[in-house]
Amino acid sequence: QKPHKRKTQLKAAGCCEEMRELKAQVANLSSLLGELSRKQESDWVSVVMQVMELESSSKHMESRLSTAESKYSEMNNQIDIMQLQAAQTVTQTSADAIYDCSSLYQKNYRISGVYKLPPDEFLGSPELEVFCDMETSGGGWTIIQRRKSGLVSFYQDWRQYKQGFGSIRGDFWLGNEHIHRLTRQPSRLRVELEDWEGNARYAEYSYFALGNELNSYRLFLGNYSGNVGKDALLYHNNTVFSTKDKDNDNCLDKCAQLRKGGYWYNCCTDSNLNGVYYRLGEHRKHMDGISWYGWHGANYSLKRVEMKIRPEAFKP
């Protein structure tokens, strides 16, 4: 999900004059955020209103998009930094701990995008950058995996899958250690899938948890619901994680090497959501693609996948 506040805002990067004006508005907004944090206010609504105003004031610049390319990333970075700083500031000044995107949602952070979760000294967990989906099915989802561009290889080793890899705004794996920590409270899993024909489906699980590293990040799943047809994670339930350098599967063949990913390989797959990203034209030819057996065949590689979690007890 793209952050709503950026739909037109990030397009607006016209000539230098207007750019400076917009940067000034950004600076004003930053200063407003600083003031909010100093007063230890947790109300994000006013900030959202400012952002909406900023959006509308930038709309007149959309005709100049042809010259905006070079300045796009700079604006993108500034606004992301603001959003991260906003999240960070509130979590530091709030009496209630922030564990995940659902915690942020309950504190009125309602815009999908990148946030920083603060370190938890008690649990010994570091600061964590996450992408929050605050819109889908009530919001509050922490995204743990995304495949959409094919720019990141998912044929990674155990260490990479443990700590996470990729780009939080693009294709990424959040990291087994982080996912294990996040799912120590009872959680739900939502898997969203899109094929190359533009069809979208989802699968939801009433319970989702990963064991710790000593237990090789074993997968625990609850009941399935959704519209994808077949529960293609059931075959992987209660299996441990395997990578190209750690063959933990239940197979005489090394599934991680055959399926080119890291996953809860059994022997081998009903789904392979961390497989190879094959583009249109190649997407029907390989057994090691991003597959979900039952919706499409074992050799159909999907266009887009997102895996996201939130606490079972979450109330929108």
């Epitope: 075959y235 063959d247 239940n250 197979c251 005489l252 063949d253 090394k254 399926r259 059994n266 022997c267 081998c268 797959t269 009903d270 392979n272 057994m287 597959s291 057996y293 065949g297 074992a298």
Partner: antibody
Framework: EVQLVESGGGLVQPGGSLRLSCAAS????????MSWVRQAPGKGLEWVSA????????YYADSVKGRFTISRDNSKNTLYLQMNSLRAEDTAVYYC??????????????????WGKGTTVTVSS | DIQMTQSPSSVSASVGDRVTITCRAS??????LAWYQQKPGKAPKLLIY???SLQSGVPSRFSGSGSGTDFTLTISSLQPEDFATYYC?????????FGQGTKVDIK
């Protein structure tokens, strides 16, 4: 014709060691997983161990784990079972078997499609 | 470990009879089941793999069915050469395990 011929069986004292061999012919040995299965006198079949085609993956029955080692030499088309710390209950006919693999959707199905005639191991003092 | 339980442990039948042997797994094994035939003093012979696929060269009077925990081997019309002991075996997870065997003998 696919053939498996076991050798190396015999009489050994408890606590002793023995190495079984299985010579394979008639197929591309390195492409197939292999397995050992045993049968005690008058008893049923008991799976002992299996090894992948490359030799990189090995599996054992709990009853032999830590005492038996399965290995293979693909250049010699030979499968081995090194048996240490032998016990009376290891007395059996030992069969080597070729493991065939079939894939249905994304799943691999294994089954032992060709068996040797067996070699007898007797552990007794 | 997955336990495999066969029933009956023995069956007496006549040539031409239909014989059914069942095998139950202690937990779901999908279709990861094979059936073997063994005659006295001989090595086992594969009959059925993946629960219902007939191995090449095996007569069509042998058939397998089932999925999950309950499986069946059926001999539609028993022939003299079919008197033997039959074993089921799961390959769903290691360690692979066999049933205790079902002996089919002459009535």
């Amino acid at each position: 014709e696919v053939q498996l011929v076991e050798s190396g069986g015999g009489l050994v004292q408890p606590g002793g060691s023995l190495r079984l061999s299985c010579a394979a012919s008639g197929f591309t040995f390195s492409s197939y997983a292999m397995s050992w299965v045993r049968q005690a006198p008058g008893k049923g079949l008991e799976w002992v161990s299996a090894i992948s085609g490359s030799g990189g993956s090995t599996y054992y029955a709990d009853s032999v784990k830590g005492r038996f080692t399965i290995s293979r030499d693909n250049s010699k088309n030979t499968l081995y079972l090194q048996m240490n710390s032998l016990r009376a209950e290891d007395t059996a006919v030992y069969y080597c078997a070729k493991v065939e693999r079939d894939m249905v959707r994304g799943h691999y199905y294994y089954y032992m499609d060709v068996w040797g005639k067996g070699t007898t191991v007797t552990v007794s003092s | 470990d997955i336990q495999m339980t066969q029933s009956p442990s023995s069956v007496s039948a006549s040539v031409g009879d239909r014989v059914t042997i069942t095998c139950r797994a202690s937990q779901g094994i999908s279709s990861w089941l094979a059936w073997y035939q063994q005659k006295p003093g001989k090595a086992p012979k594969l009959l059925i793999y993946a629960a219902s696929s007939l191995q090449s060269g095996v007569p069509s009077r042998f058939s397998g069915s089932g999925s999950g925990t309950d499986f069946t081997l059926t001999i539609s019309s028993l022939q003299p050469e079919d008197f033997a002991t039959y074993y089921c075996q799961q390959a769903n997870s290691f360690p692979w395990t066999f049933g205790q065997g079902t002996k089919v003998d002459i009535k």
